[in-house]
Interface confidence: low
């Protein structure tokens, strides 16, 4: 027993021209919900055949009202997982059908109107207990992004949820023929139901209905002591009470078989029985081929020359990974210049430019001064998307409309007097100082030759502009 879980990440218009702006019809607002249907096997079944593995319906999503002027975003979705419980073994191969439905909320006669907006059908292989598998699928003009996984409900474990866990009976290790249950070693696989009458002490089974004997016992029900009662050459301890009943550590301990393979002991070694899709000594090699359609997002599948890879996916632009399952973060290359915001729309990159910049990558600096006038002889200076005026002397402010007093900042040092002048200002220095701002002391042997006031200016009349 277990649960198939589906997480819808986004549903929205697919890339390219003609993508719909809204899932709603002209009749008004709507909301979305999803239906998932699971069918066993990889055969192309008729769409109307029953969802033999189960089905589930999501909650309704938030109400969506189209805003025609806005670019179509990912649509508001219902929260949470879609969960499809399964009672029996997980088949490993299955068909996944996801339907997106629209519920129109306008004034409908007889209540809301439902219509199927999009449907994707994928044939997949998936082991229970594995990580989330991600997928992106197109259905007409729509694009659906989702993840899914199958997980066992305890006490079931394994890639098919057929093995059961139970508390360990013996203190040190699991009973004969039983493996520890991951992840905790104090749990053991519960035994399958053996053949009726199979000795509880001397027999065990790996499959229902069989009866396999421990060392030293024989017969259809493992009731007959074997003629060789010696433990020589056998693994594990022996004693007068237990004989050879308790096997010691063996080659299958810790299960060397990867990817859900099952281990069986052979003389001095082990053998892995691999699940479909894997092979190799330890089931470590993927046997998936191009026929299984392993390349996502339109990747091109070709047979691999590498012996450890039965296929290679050539990914379309914007995707990477061994199965083209990862979207390339093209914005990480920072293609937008001048502080523009990068948006990866899937089919294209778009830069949202800061004020004052334009172009596909915000590379063009707009003329900030176009149509902007600076008064009183000021000149306009471009910069950073905001115009700035460089004002003529005697003027200030954003547009050079304000009169400025050049003496207001007290530019003359050491008590010098400031006089406004049409070309700026002039400092009349106190005795002992010289320089345009009276910043230099006169040398002891020097003489200050600056006039008390320049011709045409009177002290105390700094606001006269000639």
């Amino acid at each position: 027993a277990g649960v198939f879980e589906l997480q819808i990440h986004s549903f929205g218009p697919g890339p390219g021209p003609g993508a719909p702006r809204s899932p709603c019809s002209a009749r008004g607002p709507c909301r979305l919900f999803f239906r998932v249907c699971l069918k066993p096997g990889l055969s192309e079944e008729a769409a109307e055949s029953p969802c033999a593995l189960g089905a589930a319906l999501s909650a309704r999503g938030p109400v969506y009202t189209e805003q025609p002027e806005a670019p179509a975003p990912d649509l508001p979705l219902p929260n949470g997982l879609l969960q499809v419980p399964f009672r029996d073994a997980w088949p490993g191969t299955f068909s996944l059908i996801i339907e997106t439905w629209r519920e129109e909320l306008g004034d409908q006669i007889g209540g809301p109107a439902w219509s199927l907006l999009a449907r994707v059908t994928r044939r997949r292989r998936l082991a229970a207990g594995g990580p989330w598998a991600r997928d992106i699928q197109r259905a007409g003009a729509w694009e659906l992004r989702f993840s899914y996984r199958a997980r066992c409900e305890l006490p079931a474990v394994g890639t098919a949820c057929t093995r059961l866990c139970r508390p360990r009976s013996a203190p040190s290790r699991c009973g004969p023929g039983l493996r520890p249950c991951a992840p905790l070693e104090d749990e053991c696989e519960a035994p399958p139901v053996c053949r009726a009458g199979c000795s509880l002490e001397h027999g065990f089974c790996e499959q229902p209905g069989e009866c396999r004997c421990l060392e030293g016992w024989t017969g259809p029900l493992c009731m007959v002591p074997a003629s060789t009662s010696s433990c020589l050459g056998l693994r594990g301890p022996s004693s007068a009470t237990t004989g050879c009943l308790v096997p010691g550590p063996g080659p299958c301990d810790g299960n060397p078989c990867a990817n859900g393979g099952s281990c069986s002991e052979t003389p001095g070694s082990f053998e892995c029985t691999c699940p479909r899709g894997f092979y190799g000594l330890r089931c470590e090699v993927s046997g998936v081929t191009c026929a299984d359609g392993p390349c996502f997002n339109g990747g091109l599948c070709v047979g691999g020359a590498d012996p450890d890879s039965a296929y290679i996916c050539h990914c379309p632009p914007g995707f990477q990974g061994s199965n083209c399952e990862k979207r390339v973060d093209r914005c990480s290359l920072q293609p937008c210049r001048n502080g523009g915001l990068c948006l990866d729309l899937g089919h294209a990159l778009r830069c949202r430019c800061r004020a004052g910049f334009a172009g596909p990558r915000c590379e063009h600096n707009l003329d900030d001064c176009a149509g902007r006038a600076c008064a009183n002889g000021g000149t306009c200076v471009e910069g950073g998307g905001a115009h700035r005026c460089s004002c003529a002397l005697g003027f200030g402010g954003r547009d050079c409309r304000e009169r400025a007093d050049p003496c207001a900042a007290r530019p003359c040092a050491h008590g010098g007097r400031c006089y406004a002048h049409f070309s700026g200002l002039v400092c009349a220095c106190a005795p002992g100082y010289m320089g345009s701002r009276c910043e230099f002391p006169v040398h002891p042997d020097g003489v200050s030759a600056l006039p008390a006031a320049p011709p045409g200016l009177r002290p105390g009349d700094p606001q006269r502009y000639l």
């Epitope: 997980r151 305890l154 006490p155 508390p167 991951a182 992840p183 905790l184 070693e185």
Partner: antibody, heavy 118, light 108 residues
Framework: QVQLQESGPGLVKPSETLSLTCTVS????????WSWIRQPPGKGLEWIGY???????NYYPSLKSRVTISIDTSKNQFSLKLSSVTAADTAVYYC????????????WGQGTLVTVSS | EIVLTQSPGTLSLSPGERATLSCRAS???????LAWYQQKPGQAPRLLIY???SRATGIPDRFSGSGSGTDFTLTISRLEPEDFAVYYC?????????FGGGTKLEIK
């Protein structure tokens, strides 16, 4: 959102039995493992044991002889009993949910301090 | 049982710095079955990382976990004021479940 709340006496006499209950809200107690963890004052975390909703349990070996964890699915509660307590059992006791992805703890109660003193 | 040893016992750093916390197991932890928790005074622990490197829901990406076998590391790339707390590692490969002794991350 799953929430866990511990309840029980804050003071227990030596040699008596400590009893705590954890009430689970915002989700079903079924299909998960549930655990007790304690933390002596100023020290680290110690796992006490867990219980599955079917009643299956597993305890920390050194506490095994004194610990009983039980579950009541109808009340969405599970409980801890620790017998023959001593001052060394003084600690903040936390109940927690064990995650589906592995035997780690994804939701915790806020903890309750139990002092063993006469 | 698997004994987890955390080092250093106390780590004094300033906000904005990078923190590296170590957790060493007495025997190999299979399948990277190791989790990290953060605990602030008077609060319950909070799950940060599981599977040695997977961030739990809602955990900022400045927290990252790495390592395998017997050596595991929790890294906080750029410390925020709220990150100063005690950090514990926990293995869930084998019973009994065990925690490390903790690393106290304090403001320098």
């Amino acid at each position: 959102q799953v929430q866990l709340q511990e309840s029980g006496p804050g003071l227990v006499k030596p040699s008596e039995t400590l009893s705590l209950t954890c009430t689970v809200s915002g989700g079903s107690i079924s299909s998960y493992y549930w655990s007790w963890i304690r933390q002596p004052p100023g020290k680290g975390l110690e796992w006490i044991g867990y219980i599955y909703y079917s009643g299956r349990t597993n305890y920390y070996p050194s506490l095994k002889s004194r610990v009983t964890i039980s579950i009541d699915t109808s009340k969405n509660q599970f409980s801890l009993k620790l017998s023959s307590v001593t001052a060394a059992d003084t600690a903040v006791y936390y109940c927690a949910r064990i995650a589906v992805a592995g035997f780690f703890f994804d939701y915790w109660g806020q903890g309750t301090l139990v002092t063993v003193s006469s | 049982e698997i004994v987890l040893t955390q080092s250093p016992g106390t780590l004094s750093l300033s906000p904005g710095e990078r923190a590296t916390l170590s957790c060493r197991a007495s025997q190999s932890v299979n399948k990277n079955y190791l989790a990290w928790y953060q605990q602030k005074p008077g609060q319950a622990p909070r799950l940060l990382i599981y599977g040695a490197s997977s961030r739990a829901t809602g955990i900022p990406d400045r927290f990252s976990g790495s390592g395998s076998g017997t050596d595991f590391t929790l890294t906080i790339s750029r410390l925020e004021p709220e990150d100063f707390a005690v950090y514990y590692c926990q293995q869930y490969d084998r019973s009994p479940l065990t925690f490390g002794g903790g690393t106290k991350l304090e403001i320098k």
